[in-house]
Interface confidence: low
């Protein structure tokens, strides 16, 4: 999916009052500086396509994210603020109905919901400018 | 647990300038923005500008272009800024404050105990 | 820049009443944040994003608003929450409100 022609304003204010709580009530217990941050993104839509990346496919050792509060919140402001994300999603969403597995907080997801954090992060502040 | 810690009081002359610090610790030095606040003795907050230790990016309040600049160490996890051409009007506490943008939008939550700059001859 | 302006500078009030001290922005701004600050220290965050209260802010404060008018309220003023509070927008740059001065009788 190209992210490009999204509306960033309202995904910023939904990630603001309420995906961002969720990803750090996920986090509770975690030391900010456990994990370092090894995926970045350069632009907007670049950003959501990594958090889109990371939030819904699994990933060896973290399989379980995509029915997390923050994955469902997200999943929502993708759908309501990008044209035609939601189409695209319904093959992958009965794809993952079918295999829903038990639901296991291991470090690894630890590890990748704090690289979504960052890449939030950069998503709501695009870099200044070097002057 | 954050601190932010900065430099000590300064006296200086007109004309001069000055350099303060601001060590972080506690957390990641890069993750996070760190602004600069001016406070003149019994009046309001001023914020002077912004920088990223990601990478080195500033902004600042047109008023204070020229006047401040905002350099950061990331070996060091220290921020810094100087002030040139120092004049009476200069003389404030300053403070360093770091900007945390994963927290209900973007607010200076943590603060250092502020550096107090003296100008006079 | 955006302007912001508080009103009253000074507010003058008695252990358990209601008090409310507003911010207005010369343009509209998406969230205000809200400081407090005691003589001699540094200002703390004391509600974020309009209405979230910081960490250990007494349940008894709370904040609202949108666009240009922003206000913070005290359901019943208590004597440590005599103080300078401060509005913070962060839409277009960063700018403080000249602060209120909340004094208890």
């Known amino acids: 999916y190209d992210f490009t022609n999204c509306d960033f304003e309202k995904i910023k204010a939904a990630y603001l009052s309420t995906i961002s709580k969720d990803l750090i009530t996920y986090m509770s217990g975690t030391k900010s500086t456990e994990f370092n941050n090894t995926v970045s993104c350069s632009n907007r839509p670049h950003c959501l396509t990594e958090i889109q990346s990371l939030t819904f496919n699994p990933t060896a050792g973290c399989a379980s994210l995509a029915k997390e509060m923050f994955a469902m919140k997200t999943k929502a402001a993708l759908a309501i603020w990008c044209p035609g994300y939601s189409e695209t999603q319904i093959n992958a969403t009965q794809a993952m109905k079918k295999r829903r597995k038990r639901k296991v907080t291991t470090n690894k997801c630890l590890e990748q919901v704090s690289q979504l954090q960052g890449l939030w992060r950069r998503f709501n502040r695009p870099l200044l400018k070097q002057q | 647990e954050v601190q932010l810690q900065q430099s000590g009081p300064v006296l200086v002359k007109p004309g001069a300038s000055v350099k303060m610090s601001c060590k972080a610790s506690g957390y990641t030095f890069t993750d996070d923005y760190m602004n600069w606040v001016k406070q003149s003795h019994g009046k309001s907050l001023e914020w002077i500008g912004i920088i990223s230790p990601y990478n080195g990016g500033t902004s600042y309040n047109q008023k204070f272009k020229g006047k401040a600049t905002l350099t950061v160490d990331k070996s060091s996890s220290t921020a810094y800024m100087e002030l040139n051409s120092l004049t009476s009007e200069d003389s404030a506490v300053y403070y360093c404050?770091?900007?945390?943008?994963?927290?209900?939008?973007?607010?200076?939550?943590?603060w250092g105990q502020g550096t107090s700059v003296t100008v006079s001859s | 820049q955006i302007v912001l302006s508080q009103s009253p500078a000074i507010l003058s009030a008695s252990p358990g009443e209601k008090v409310t001290m507003t911010c207005r922005a010369s343009?509209?701004?998406?969230?205000m944040h809200w400081y407090q600050q005691k003589p001699g220290s540094s200002p703390k965050p004391w509600i974020y994003a309009t209405s979230n209260l910081a960490s250990g802010v007494p349940a008894r404060f709370s904040g609202s608003g949108s666009g240009t008018s922003y206000s913070l309220t005290i359901s019943r003023v208590e004597a440590e929450d005599a103080a300078t509070y401060y509005c913070?927008?962060?839409?277009?740059?960063?700018?403080f409100g000249g602060g209120t001065k909340l004094e208890i009788k």
């Open positions: 913070q927008q962060w839409s277009s740059n960063r700018t």
């Open positions: 404050a770091r900007e945390d943008y994963d927290y209900d939008g973007y607010a200076m939550d943590h």
């Open positions: 343009s509209s701004v998406s969230y």
